[in-house]
Amino acid sequence: CDLPQTHSLGSRRTLMLLAQMRRISLFSCLKDRHDFGFPQEEFGNQFQKAETIPVLHEMIQQIFNLFSTKDSSAAWDETLLDKFYTELYQQLNDLEACVIQGVGVTETPLMKEDSILAVRKYFQRITLYLKEKKYSPCAWEVVRAEIMRSFSLSTNLQESLRSKE
């Protein structure tokens, strides 16, 4: 399954939108930094494309879920959020098309499930952090910065997979 070139452009647009969503000066938020334990090893280059597609799908689905809450809607600009949802939705569609084609359905299912679980736990930690910080503006900015970093790392994996073909 070949992800369309528009998928890469969509990923870049997603990062640009995340950058534009910033609402406050980040310099006041230093002390709110937190170690969310991004499972970077689940996005390592050792994975085959068959194994990464469902993990990338889970990552984007979780980002979508995180920013679709009412707390998120209160924190961010509505117009930018709508554009953000649209980009994520398109990327989910691209990845789902690959999953439907049967890529990796029979390959290393346990490894895949472990990776998906690690991604889910990562987002649970993010959600818990936001709750503990009472969804403060700084907490949301820390989360936005974290998502930009983790999304960028997962996007880099997509690019490396494409270049290996």
Epitope: S25, L26, F27, C29, L30, K31, R33, A145, E146, M148
Partner: antibody, heavy 121, light 107 residues
Framework: EVQLVQSGAEVKKPGESLKISCKGS????????IGWVRQMPGKGLEWMGI????????AYSPSFQGQVTISADKSISTAYLQWSSLKASDTAMYYC??????????????WGQGTLVTVSS | DIQMTQSPSSLSASVGDRVTITCRAS??????LNWYQQKPGKAPKLLIY???SLQSGVPSRFSGSGSGTDFTLTISSLQPEDFATYYC?????????FGQGTKVEIK
């Protein structure tokens, strides 16, 4: 390879203006902040200020607020430190260093080689 | 502003010695504390970040500990290349501040 390359040493007279630079390479320049640190001869490190190159937001130490200006041009991955009117007390080594912003990552993990500024009449 | 106070300001030690440098913050900074090493004519080098995390490429003889207001940098067995000046720095809030430095000299 991550690198921060600073402009060369400067010798200036009191009252003159100056702009020194710090060019980042080997990483996404807008994903990190750039901080500036002063070290006067034989003295310790003093944090001057910082810039977020993604939108040029800045923060200054109260000691340096109004004395210097920090700026950046993300199109050429370069941060700047400038003075409009130098004083003899500005004689020092100036370092730039990158900061991960709000990400949980090492602070000031890469430094420039330093720019020596000498102000003398 | 958060003041950072290092002690001692200088110390003399021999190769193989265990060396401890302390840093105290004027208010709690959680674990937002970094340690740097600087040699004459060179830029500072990050050794420890977030109080106890060893920076990539730094020898394991360097370690950091502490939280809140009191922090320690330990060199378990001093090597010839470790003679330098060491600085702590808080990254809890702006303005960022450094300790005054501790010079480690050869005895």
């Amino acid at each position: 390879e991550v690198q921060l390359v600073q402009s060369g040493a400067e010798v200036k007279k009191p009252g003159e203006s100056l702009k020194i630079s710090c060019k980042g390479s080997g990483y996404s320049f807008t994903s990190y902040w750039i901080g500036w640190v002063r070290q006067m001869p034989g003295k310790g490190l003093e944090w001057m200020g910082i810039i977020d190159p993604s939108d040029s937001d800045t923060a200054y130490s109260p000691s340096f607020q109004g004395q210097v200006t920090i700026s950046a041009d993300k199109s050429i991955s370069t941060a700047y430190l400038q003075w409009s009117s130098l004083k003899a007390s500005d004689t020092a080594m100036y370092y730039c260093a990158r900061h991960p912003g709000l990400n949980w990552a090492p602070d000031f993990d890469y430094w420039g080689q330093g720019t020596l500024v000498t102000v003398s009449s | 502003d958060i003041q950072m106070t290092q002690s001692p300001s200088s110390l003399s030690a021999s190769v193989g010695d265990r060396v401890t440098i302390t840093c105290r913050a004027s208010q709690s900074i959680a674990d937002f504390l970094n340690w740097y090493q600087q040699k004459p004519g060179k830029a500072p080098k990050l050794l420890i970040y977030f109080a106890s995390s060893l920076q990539s490429g730094v020898p394991s003889r360097f370690s950091g500990s502490g939280s809140g207001t009191d922090f320690t940098l330990t060199i378990s067995s001093l090597q010839p290349e470790d003679f330098a000046t060491y600085y702590c720095q808080q990254s809890h809030s702006f303005p960022l501040t450094f300790g005054q430095g501790t010079k480690v000299e050869i005895k």
